[in-house]
Amino acid sequence: SIPWNLERITPPRYRADEYQPPDGGSLVEVYLLDTSIQSDHREIEGRVMVTDFENVPEEDGTRFHRQASKCDSHGTHLAGVVSGRDAGVAKGASMRSLRVLNCQGKGTVSGTLIGLEFIRKSQLVQPVGPLVVLLPLAGGYSRVLNAACQRLARAGVVLVTAAGNFRDDACLYSPASAPEVITVGATNAQDQPVTLGTLGTNFGRCVDLFAPGEDIIGASSDCSTCFVSQSGTSQAAAHVAGIAAMMLSAEPELTLAELRQRLIHFSAKDVINMAWFPEDQQVLTPNLVATLPPSTHETGGQLLCRTVWSAHSGPTRTATATARCAPEEELLSCSSFSRSGRRRGDWIEAIGGQQVCKALNAFGGEGVYAVARCCLVPRANCSIHNTPAARAGLETHVHCHQKDHVLTGCSFHWEVEDLSVRRQPALRSRRQPGQCVGHQAASVYASCCHAPGLECKIKEHGISGPSEQVTVACEAGWTLTGCNVLPGASLTLGAYSVDNLCVARVHDTARADRTSGEATVAAAICCRSRPSAKASWVQ
Amino acid sequence: QDEDGDYEELMLALPSQEDGLADEAAHVATATFRRCSKEAWRLPGTYIVVLMEETQRLQIEQTAHRLQTRAARRGYVIKVLHIFYDLFPGFLVKMSSDLLGLALKLPHVEYIEEDSFVFAQ
């Protein structure tokens, strides 16, 4: 029947009978680094050029028999998923295949590096249109493989990779852990994360989004007209490579940062059953399933933002966590989160000419995460204003004093270790519009930006009764740029953004202690970009 | 996504006097050796030598040649399998792990990574 995966990635307005994929990725070349492929399969014949590149290790075992159909199985299927005539995502995309995996599906980091270099050389010798590189493979964490991916990405190439099939944190594998690569996890027809035997899809902060990856119909190397169903994060990555090819074909000037933000923006949100993931990974794992954009690829001028989590700081007393945006993105706010609630806040600082989001662990804490809100703001001029901690009992106020600059985020960082003596910081929209307000021993940081037509406002939501979390969402047309918690309890775990929702987390043990008068408030800064208007703070 | 994962990094700054060469005595290794945390995935004997970002094309070749020469003085044969110019400066080498200390002290070396397997997903 109609492949579930193609239906799933097709937005509802496309599902009408008249749907024909718009140009199907015809301006884009997709490089596939995988096994050998059966290039005369009806699905991909004339669409895939087999390059002369081959760098694979010997197959294991003395009695291993190279059976052509087995050698070609993985690569042929993926080529079909990307651009197959019948079951492909981007039916117009042309592909080039490089053999870096042997007949047993094994390759080496060095072979993959040489393959990536081959692509870079080809790009230098004969520059073509947009390039997508599909890496449906994974090994252990490799600094050099990640570095090579970074260099290729900075040369304008879009790299898409499998998150890995190890039911583990994707950050422990490469190239999945490379920040510049679009890392894809796998979901099934029921929007559940894919289980593969005793293992399954990888997860965590290094995954950018998920895509269909179970029972994916595609070209089989058993015969030139056969179809086979395969499962894995490779299949999921192939879907995203196809979607990327479609998007780049429609808008060839898209940068990697713009493409990633669009993939996130057009994804189906909050459809994955997160209970499958380990509890400590659920908050870090994006609840996003890739879909094609509606027929117009324009985002309607909407401000596009994503949330980037740092690695865990570790438990030492002075441990810090650092979250970074991509070079083209603006860091509009920084917050922090700690499962124990023992954190000393967050701030933005410049490292090597780039602003980064930092968070600091507190004495007795099990560690913190820094949470950056990274946005695409055309022609933005952003800066950080900070005020040292006020004397005990006094509030510290910071606002954006430059003309036409608006507040996009607030950060607070405490000098004192003792959590019991300080009242956590607050963000007040009613008394001081456009200001960050800190209390007792808090240094306050305001993120201030100027961009044509950028306007922002604060939205708050408080809960007095027992609650593990308080949320507030930005309304349609507005984008969440900043998220903070204004505590009513003695201990808050921090705040973070999930798509357009600001989530303020409260410590479990604090719930019983709370009196009805102490509301815990989630405070969101919501912004929008209206190019015709001038920058403004909305009351 | 940028911090190192579950990953082995070893400092192998061996005493520079060991080979008695004047130019080596002046260079103390600050480079690190890295390898896959999963032992079964490692490929000992093949190493990716990564040089500093600003290393020139000629210097890459000189560094590889220097490693071969110094290894030969110790009675080791080194095979340079590939030189990386276009994505990052470095080279791929087949050699005994005994030579890692020597390689880490070469000028321009940022780190050395042991080759490892990748798998179809």
């Epitope: 008249e18 099934n188 289980t195 029972d215 | -």
Partner: antibody, heavy 118, light 113 residues
Framework: EVQLVESGGGLVQPGGSLRLSCAAS????????MNWVRQAPGKGLDWVST????????NYADSVKGRFIISRDSSKHTLYLQMNSLRAEDTAVYYC???????????WGRGTLVTVSS | DIVMTQSPDSLAVSLGERATINCKSS????????????LGWYQQKPGQPPNLLIY???TRESGVPDRFSGSGSGTDFTLTISSLQAEDVAVYYC?????????FGQGTKLEIK
């Protein structure tokens, strides 16, 4: 040799249960969806159920929904149909059929007869 | 559910003559994304399981003689046997696999006149 062999049919009373098996050989079982199709004596073909290659997705005809369960064991290369609350109208030859993965059936077993009668 | 209706119910044709069987679906089985009609034809000889002849409405399964051909699109389809042979005596079924539940036509019995 590429083949499917059904077993487990027989005579059962209304309200009873039966479990059909289908042993697959000669192809990569895990990579193909599998189906059960039945044919009442002297009648046409009637699709009963399908299961995806991974076993993660199943579909049933309305007439058997809630009574029949399709499953597969990838290690044994075997497809199953657990039939509960059987009715006289379930009497048929039950065929196991390999899916091309598009929903058409490119390999069939020889069938096993299920008779529901008191 | 998509209802499949075949005509005629039975057909007698002389050896060497052309046999034509029609199949109509209650809704289109053409998938625009790949421009394929999700329709197959099966042959079932007495005492045997069905055998796939045609898929995608017009593509012959490997090993099927070229006297068998399929045509049509959307909702109307035809199976043609260009020159009837004795071994073609069987019941022929069309099937839509556009969506579950998969449905078959009621069958057409082909005999020799």
């Amino acid at each position: 040799e590429v083949q499917l062999v059904e077993s487990g049919g027989g005579l059962v009373q209304p309200g009873g249960s039966l479990r059909l098996s289908c042993a697959a050989s000669g192809f990569t079982f895990n990579n193909y969806a599998m189906n059960w199709v039945r044919q009442a004596p002297g009648k046409g073909l009637d699709w009963v159920s399908t299961i995806s290659g991974s076993g993660g997705t199943t579909n049933y005809a309305d007439s058997v929904k809630g009574r029949f369960i399709i499953s597969r064991d990838s290690s044994k290369h075997t497809l199953y149909l657990q039939m509960n609350s059987l009715r006289a109208e379930d009497t048929a030859v039950y065929y196991c059929a390999k899916d091309s993965n598009w929903g058409n059936f490119d390999l069939w077993g020889r069938g096993t007869l299920v008779t529901v009668s008191s | 559910d998509i209802v499949m209706t075949q005509s005629p119910d039975s057909l007698a044709v002389s050896l060497g003559e052309r046999a034509t069987i029609n199949c109509k679906s209650s809704q289109s089985v053409l998938y625009r994304s790949n421009n394929r009609n999700f329709l197959g034809w099966y042959q079932q000889k007495p005492g045997q399981p069905p055998n796939l002849l045609i898929y995608w409405a017009s593509t012959r399964e490997s090993g099927v003689p070229d006297r068998f051909s399929g045509s049509g699109s959307g909702t109307d389809f035809t199976l043609t046997i260009s020159s009837l042979q004795a071994e073609d005596v069987a019941v022929y079924y069309c099937q839509q696999y556009y969506t579950t539940p998969y449905t078959f036509g009621q069958g057409t019995k082909l005999e020799i006149k």
